[in-house]
C-alpha cells in the first residue's frame, strides 16, 4: 500500500522515493502531488484511474520524456507542473491533447530549443514557465498563438537578443507579465515589443543592462501598454535625462531600480515619467539628490530610498547629501522610506513640497540626529503625516515642540534610540491627533505629572525597558490619558507605584507589566496594605505580570475585571493562592502560571477562571499529589477541552516523596473522597 496522504480530493505522494505511479488512490482525486520522487516517466495508462485530475504536480523528479496520451487520459487537467526534471525536447505532439491547460510549468529542465509549435493547442493557457532551461531565443512558435497567455516566464536562460520575429507568436496575447530576468541580453531590435499584443509588466532584473542598453530598451517600449518595469540588479551606475526618455509615450506606473549600484541620479532623469506611481531606488550608492533629481514625478505615490545612498567608508570624504527641495516635485507622494542610510541630518527644507505625505520611515537614516529640535521637522509643516518612524537613530534628546509641525500625526515611533531625559510633556506639543507613541528600548525616561498632559487622544503608549523613573508620583503621569487602550511598562524594574497609577483609564485593554519588581506591593505586610493598582480597569482584556517576584496575590485585586481574557502570572513565586481571587474571571481564555511554586489546584480558587479557558500553562510547578491538593484538578484535566501543552512531561508531582516525578494526569483520583461524577 502507498504512503500517500489523502484529504478531501487531494492526494499528496511527495517525498516517498516513488519510482512508479501509485495505483490504489481514490479514483475521484482532483489534485495529485508527486513531487520529490524518483519518477522517470508518467505512463498514461497508470493515470486511467484518475480521470478527474485537474492538477498534476510531478516536479523534482527525473522525467526525461512526456507522452502525448497523458492529456488524453486526463481531459480535465488544468495545471501541469514538471519543474526540475530532465526534459530536453518537446515536440508538436507533446502537449497536443492538453487543450484545457491553464498553467504549464517547465522550469529547470534542459530544453535548449523549441522546435515548430508545441504550444499551438494551448488556447486556454494563462501561465507558461520556461525559466532556467538554456533557451537562446524567445521564439516558442511560428504563427500567432497562446492568445490567452498572461504570464510568460523566461528568466535564467541564454537569450542574447529580443527580435520582433521571435516574439510575433504573441501577437494576440495580453501579457500581464514577461520575465526575461537573468538573461545576457545585448540587443533589443527595432519593434521587438510592438509585435506583442499587449505587454503590461516586463521584468529584466539581473540582465547586465548598462545605461546605453537601458535607454535603447526604453525606446523599444515606447507606445506599448507597459505599466510595470523592473530593472533591478543591472549595474545601472548612472541615469540621465535621456535614460528613460523613451518611456514618455507610455503609462508606466511602477519602476524598480533597486540593487544597481546607482551612483549618480542626473537632473531630470525621471522627467518623462509623469504617470509613475511607484519607484524603488533601494540598495544603491547614490551620492547626492538635488532639487531636480525627481523633477517630473508629478504622480508618484510611493518612493523607497531604503539603503539607497552611499555607505560611509574611511575613504569617503563626505556623507551622501540630500539638498534642500530635493522632494519638491513629489506633490502626490504618500509613502517615503529612507531607512538604513547615512544622511547626516535634516535641513530646513529637506521635505518641503511633500504636501500629500502620510507615511515617513526614517529608521537608521541619520548619523547626526542626536538631538531633535523644533527645527528638525519644520519642512514637514505642510505634510499631512500620519506615521513617523524614527527608530535606531541614536537620538538622545527631544526638545520642546519638536513635533509641533505634525498636527495630524497618528503614530510616532521613537523606539530603539538612546533617549535619556525628563519628559516635561512639552515634547509632544501640537500632537493633537496622536494615537500611538512608541518609546520602548531607550536609555532613561523620568516621568512628571505633565509628561502626557498634551496628548489626551493617545490610545497606545509603549514604555518597555526605558529605566522608567518617577512612576509613583501623584497625580499619576497617565491620568490625562483617558483614551488609552494599550500601556506597556514592562522591563523597568518598577518597585514603587501608587494605587492611583492607572486611575481613570477605563478604556485600558492591554497592560504589560512583566519584568518589574512589584512583589512588596501585593504583600499583606506592605505598609498601608496591598496596593490595588488595577482598580477600575473594567475593560482590561490582557494582563501580563510575569517575572515580578510575586509571592502573594491579595484578595480583591482582580475584583470586577470581568472582561479579562488573558492573565500571565508566570515566573513568579506564587505558592498558596487565596480562595475567591479569580472569582470574577469567568471569561478568561488564557491563564499562565508556569514556573511558580504552586502545590495545590483547588476548585475554590480555580473553578471560575478554568470554566471557559482555551489555554492553560501551569508547567514546572511542584504539585503536591494528594487528594486534597490536586484531585479536582486531575479530574478537570481529564475531561477538559482546554489546550494544556506538555501535560505529560512538564506537569509532574513533587510531593509526597513516593510520587516524585510522577505525571500528574496519571494520578488516580478514584480513591479520593468526593470523586463522584465530576462537577463542572
Amino acid at each position: 500500500t502507498n504512503q500517500c496522504t489523502v484529504r478531501y480530493n487531494v492526494a499528496d505522494c511527495s517525498h516517498l522515493k516513488l519510482t512508479h505511479i501509485p495505483d490504489d488512490l481514490p479514483s475521484n482525486i482532483t489534485v495529485l502531488n508527486l513531487t520529490h520522487n524518483q519518477l522517470r516517466r508518467l505512463p498514461p495508462t497508470n493515470f486511467t484511474r484518475y480521470s478527474q485530475l485537474a492538477i498534476l504536480d510531478a516536479g523534482f523528479n527525473s522525467i526525461s520524456k512526456l507522452e502525448p496520451e497523458l492529456c488524453q487520459i486526463l481531459p480535465l487537467l488544468k495545471v501541469l507542473n514538471l519543474q526540475h526534471n530532465e526534459l530536453s525536447q518537446i515536440s508538436d505532439q507533446t502537449f497536443v491533447f492538453c487543450t484545457n491547460l491553464t498553467e504549464l510549468d517547465l522550469m529547470s529542465n534542459s530544453i535548449h530549443k523549441i522546435k515548430s509549435n508545441p504550444f499551438k493547442n494551448q488556447k486556454n493557457l494563462i501561465k507558461l514557465d520556461l525559466s532556467h532551461n538554456g533557451l537562446s531565443s524567445t521564439k516558442l512558435g511560428t504563427g500567432v498563438q497562446l492568445e490567452n497567455l498572461q504570464e510568460l516566464l523566461l528568466a535564467k536562460n541564454k537569450i542574447l537578443a529580443l527580435r520582433s520575429e521571435e516574439l510575433e507568436f504573441l501577437g494576440n496575447s495580453s501579457l500581464r507579465k514577461l520575465d526575461l530576468s537573468s538573461n545576457p541580453l545585448k540587443e533589443f531590435s527595432p519593434g521587438c515589443f510592438q509585435t506583442i499584443g499587449k505587454l503590461f509588466a516586463l521584468l529584466l532584473n539581473n540582465a547586465q543592462l548598462n545605461p546605453h542598453l537601458t535607454e535603447k530598451l526604453c525606446w523599444e517600449l515606447s507606445n506599448t501598454s507597459i505599466q510595470n518595469l523592473s530593472l533591478a540588479n543591472n549595474q545601472l551606475l548612472a541615469t540621465s535625462e535621456s535614460t528613460f526618455s523613451g518611456l514618455k509615450w507610455t503609462n508606466l506606473t511602477q519602476l524598480d531600480l533597486s540593487y544597481n549600484n546607482l551612483h549618480d541620479v542626473g537632473n531630470g532623469s525621471f522627467s518623462y515619467l509623469p504617470s509613475l506611481r511607484y519607484l524603488s531606488l533601494e540598495y544603491n550608492n547614490i551620492q547626492r539628490l538635488s532639487p531636480r533629481s525627481f523633477y517630473g514625478l508629478s504622480n508618484l505615490r510611493y518612493l523607497s530610498l531604503k539603503r539607497a545612498f552611499t555607505k560611509q567608508s574611511v575613504s569617503l570624504a563626505s556623507h551622501p547629501n540630500i539638498d534642500d527641495f530635493s522632494f519638491q516635485w513629489l506633490k502626490y507622494l504618500e509613502y517615503l522610506n529612507m531607512d538604513d542610510n547615512n544622511i547626516p541630518s535634516t535641513k530646513s527644507n529637506t521635505f518641503t513640497g511633500l504636501v500629500s505625505l502620510k507615511y515617513l520611515s526614517l529608521s537608521k537614516t541619520f548619523t547626526s540626529l542626536q538631538t531633535l529640535t523644533n527645527e528638525t521637522f519644520v519642512s514637514l509643516a505642510h505634510s499631512p503625516l500620519l506615521t513617523l518612524n524614527l527608530t535606531k537613530n541614536h537620538i538622545s534628546k527631544i526638545a520642546n515642540g519638536t513635533f509641533s509641525w505634525l498636527g495630524q500625526l497618528r503614530i510616532l515611533d521613537l523606539g530603539l534610540n538612546e533617549i535619556e531625559q525628563k519628559l516635561s510633556g512639552q515634547e509632544w506639543r501640537g500632537l493633537r491627533n496622536i494615537f500611538e507613541i512608541y518609546l520602548s528600548y531607550n536609555k532613561y525616561l523620568q516621568l512628571s505629572t505633565s509628561s502626557f498632559a498634551l496628548v489626551p487622544s493617545l490610545q497606545r503608549l509603549m514604555l518597555r525597558r526605558v529605566a522608567l523613573k518617577n512612576v509613583d508620583i501623584s497625580p499619576s503621569p497617565f491620568r490625562p490619558l483617558r483614551n488609552l487602550t494599550i500601556l506597556d511598562l514592562s522591563n523597568n524594574n518598577i518597585a514603587n507605584i501608587n494605587e492611583d497609577l492607572l486611575e481613570g483609564l477605563e478604556n485600558l485593554e492591554i497592560l504589560d507589566f512583566q519584568h518589574n519588581n512589584l512583589a512588596r506591593l501585593w504583600k499583606r505586610a506592605n505598609p498601608g496594605g496591598p496596593v490595588n493598582f488595577l482598580k477600575g480597569l473594567s475593560h482590561l482584556h490582557i494582563l501580563n505580570l510575569e517575572s515580578n517576584g510575586l509571592d502573594e496575590i491579595p484578595v480583591g485585586v482582580f475584583k470586577n475585571l470581568f472582561e479579562l481574557k488573558s492573565i500571565n502570572l508566570g515566573l513568579n513565586n506564587l505558592n498558596k493562592l487565596e480562595p475567591f481571587i479569580f472569582d470574577d474571571q469567568t471569561s478568561l481564555r488564557s491563564l499562565n502560571l508556569q514556573k511558580n511554586l504552586i502545590t495545590s489546584v483547588e476548585k475554590d480558587v480555580f473553578g471560575p477562571p478554568f470554566q471557559n479557558l482555551n489555554s492553560l500553562d501551569m508547567r514546572f510547578n511542584p504539585f503536591d499529589c494528594t487528594c486534597e491538593s490536586i484531585s479536582w484538578f486531575v479530574n478537570w484535566i481529564n475531561q477538559t477541552h482546554t489546550n494544556i501543552s506538555e501535560l505529560s512531561t512538564h506537569y509532574l508531582c513533587n510531593t509526597p516523596h513516593h510520587y516524585y516525578g510522577f505525571p500528574l494526569k496519571l494520578f488516580d483520583t478514584s480513591s479520593c473522597k468526593d470523586s463522584a461524577p465530576f462537577e463542572l
Epitope: 470586577n560 470581568f562 470554566q611
Partner: nanobody, 125 residues
Framework: EVQLVESGGGLVQAGGSLRLSCVAS????????MGWFRQAPGKEREFVAS????????YYGDSVKGRFAVSRDSGKNTGFLQMNSLKSEDTAVYYC??????????????????WGQGTQVTVSS
C-alpha cells in the same frame, strides 16, 4: 434567555423573619455571583447582600449586617436571603440579580447583568 424569579415576600411584623428565594433559569454556568437589592418608595436602589458562585464568600450592606444572611444552592441555581429582626425601614421591593462575575463584588448595580421582577416585603410596626 436568563430569567430570575423571586418569591417569599409578604407582610411581617417588626422583629419577625422572612426567607426570600431566587430561582435562576437559562444559565449556561453556575460560576456567577448572586446579589440582593431593595428599593423603597421614593428612594434609590440599595445594595443588601451578595454571595459568590460557591456560596463560601458573602458581602453585606451596612444596614443589614448581623440581621440578614445570604446563601445559595449552586446545584439548583437558587439563592436565598434569610431576613431576621426585621424593622419597618426594611419595607421595600426586594430584587435578586446575577453578577457578571463569580465573586461578591462591591455592591455596585453596574456589576450585575440580569435582574428579577422583585418581591414586596412589608414590615409593620
Amino acid at each position: 434567555e436568563v430569567q430570575l424569579v423571586e418569591s417569599g415576600g409578604g407582610l411581617v411584623q417588626a422583629g419577625g423573619s422572612l426567607r426570600l428565594s431566587c430561582v435562576a433559569s437559562g444559565l449556561v454556568s453556575s460560576y456567577y455571583g448572586m446579589g440582593w437589592f431593595r428599593q423603597a418608595p421614593g428612594k434609590e436602589r440599595e445594595f443588601v447582600a451578595s454571595v459568590n458562585w460557591s456560596g463560601k464568600d458573602t458581602y453585606y450592606g451596612d444596614s443589614v449586617k448581623g440581621r440578614f444572611a445570604v446563601s445559595r444552592d449552586s446545584g439548583k441555581n437558587t439563592g436565598f436571603l434569610q431576613m431576621n429582626s426585621l424593622k419597618s425601614e426594611d419595607t421595600a421591593v426586594y430584587y435578586c440579580a446575577r453578577r457578571r462575575g463569580g465573586g461578591t463584588g462591591t455592591g455596585n448595580p453596574s456589576e450585575y447583568d440580569y435582574w428579577g421582577q422583585g418581591t414586596q416585603v412589608t414590615v409593620s410596626s
